[in-house]
């Protein structure tokens, strides 16, 4: 049975040449947290392992940071950065949990963070 | 091009202990997971464990756990996978293999050509 | 730890004719979050290390000829050969690439009838 919620920073927006944290909070389990990869649609960013640590995909290498804690940190912002990233933790026992958030990177200096959701 | 060259064939007897290397080359060694797969004769594919170069931390199946070591040298680009308390069923084809990001995944892309232990009295 | 089950152990298909592989795990592999499956096929030829063939259980390694294709989501999973060439003998294996530690199936021998 999952009973875990994540929490995301839900919708957040940046402005371009910036940096943005991205984070999730798994409540409500007991679960043990065994792994948390960050991930777009279409590719990995980077993986945090309890045994081995923080690995970052080689092609973001350069422009993505650990931390702080089970976040990730996107640095160098461009307009094509706009779009979903996903935070899977894989738990024991429980299994997988996913959260979602939408970044929207701006040309201007307007950049407001969105509400908190949850995902179940 | 990427290769990975491991260390030759060895005979040990049973209880001894093993040290097979993989050298990495044509690519950034801490950038890239290194993984351990055994292979019994005529057997399938079985994960020993992986390092993360980058940070030194390794991660074993719990049946290596205790008897398997992974470690990794920076400076000269090299893995290395030491068993100990070796008994007959260690007698495999021990490859490495490097674990590339393939879109949402981690795969292993680029193998050794394999070390054969071979334990024996 | 998630368990990889292949049908057949072994399969012999005549030159040109179809063969197919089946994959089983004992836990989903399908991220529905991101509707992604963490399933790899690779095909391992005597004396060989194994080689790629397929990754997210349907996309195809760049190189690898199109008589190869993977399917299936979840817990089931199909690698076929449209076409069976000789170069194509070999034993084929399933992998879970969806958590540590990284499973194997035990392998089907492909052969010429």
């Known amino acids: 049975m999952m009973t875990g919620t994540i929490e995301t920073t839900g919708n957040i927006s940046a402005e371009k040449g910036g940096s943005i944290i991205l984070q999730c909070h798994l409540s409500s389990t007991t679960a043990q947290v065994t792994q948390v990869n960050w991930e777009q649609q279409d590719q990995l960013l980077a993986i945090c392992n309890a045994d081995l640590g923080w690995h970052i995909s080689p092609s973001f290498k350069d422009r993505v940071a650990p931390g702080p804690g089970l976040g990730l940190t996107l640095q160098s912002l461009t307009v094509n950065d706009t779009g979903e990233y996903f935070c899977i933790y894989h738990t024991y026992p429980d299994g997988t949990y996913t959260g979602r958030i939408f970044l929207e990177v701006l040309e201007s200096s307007v950049a407001e963070h969105g509400a908190r959701f949850q995902i179940p | 091009q990427v290769q990975l060259q491991q260390s030759g064939a060895e005979v040990k007897k049973p209880g001894a202990s093993v040290k097979v290397s993989c050298k990495a080359s044509?690519?950034?060694?801490?950038?890239?997971?290194i993984e351990w797969v055994k292979q019994a004769p005529g057997q399938g594919l079985e994960w020993i464990g992986v390092i993360n170069p980058g940070s030194g931390g390794s991660k074993y199946n719990e049946k290596f756990k205790g008897r398997a070591t992974i470690t990794a040298d920076k400076s000269t680009s090299t893995a290395y996978m030491e068993l100990s308390s070796l008994r007959s069923e260690d007698t495999a084809v021990y490859f490495c293999?490097?674990?590339?990001?393939?879109?949402?995944?981690?795969?292993?892309?680029?193998w050794g050509q394999g070390t054969t232990v071979t334990v024996s009295s | 730890d998630i368990v990889m089950t292949q049908s057949p152990d072994s399969l012999a298909v005549s030159l040109g004719e179809r063969a197919t592989i089946n994959c089983k795990s004992s836990?989903?592999?399908?991220?529905?979050?991101?509707?992604?499956?963490?399933l790899a096929w690779y095909q391992q030829k005597p004396g060989q290390p194994p080689k790629l063939l397929i990754y997210g259980a349907s996309t195809r390694e760049s190189g690898v000829p199109d008589r190869f294709s993977g399917s299936g989501s979840g817990t089931d999973f199909t690698l076929t050969i449209s076409s069976l060439q000789a170069e194509d003998v070999a034993v084929y294996y399933c992998?879970?690439?969806?958590?540590?530690?990284?499973?194997f199936g035990g392998g089907t021998k492909l052969e010429i009838k």
């Open positions: 992998q879970n690439d969806h958590r540590y530690p990284f499973t």
């Open positions: 044509g690519y950034a060694f801490t950038n890239y997971l």
């Open positions: 836990q989903s592999l399908l991220n529905s979050g991101i509707q992604k499956n963490y």
């Open positions: 293999a490097r674990t590339g990001v393939y879109g949402n995944f981690l795969i292993f892309d680029y």
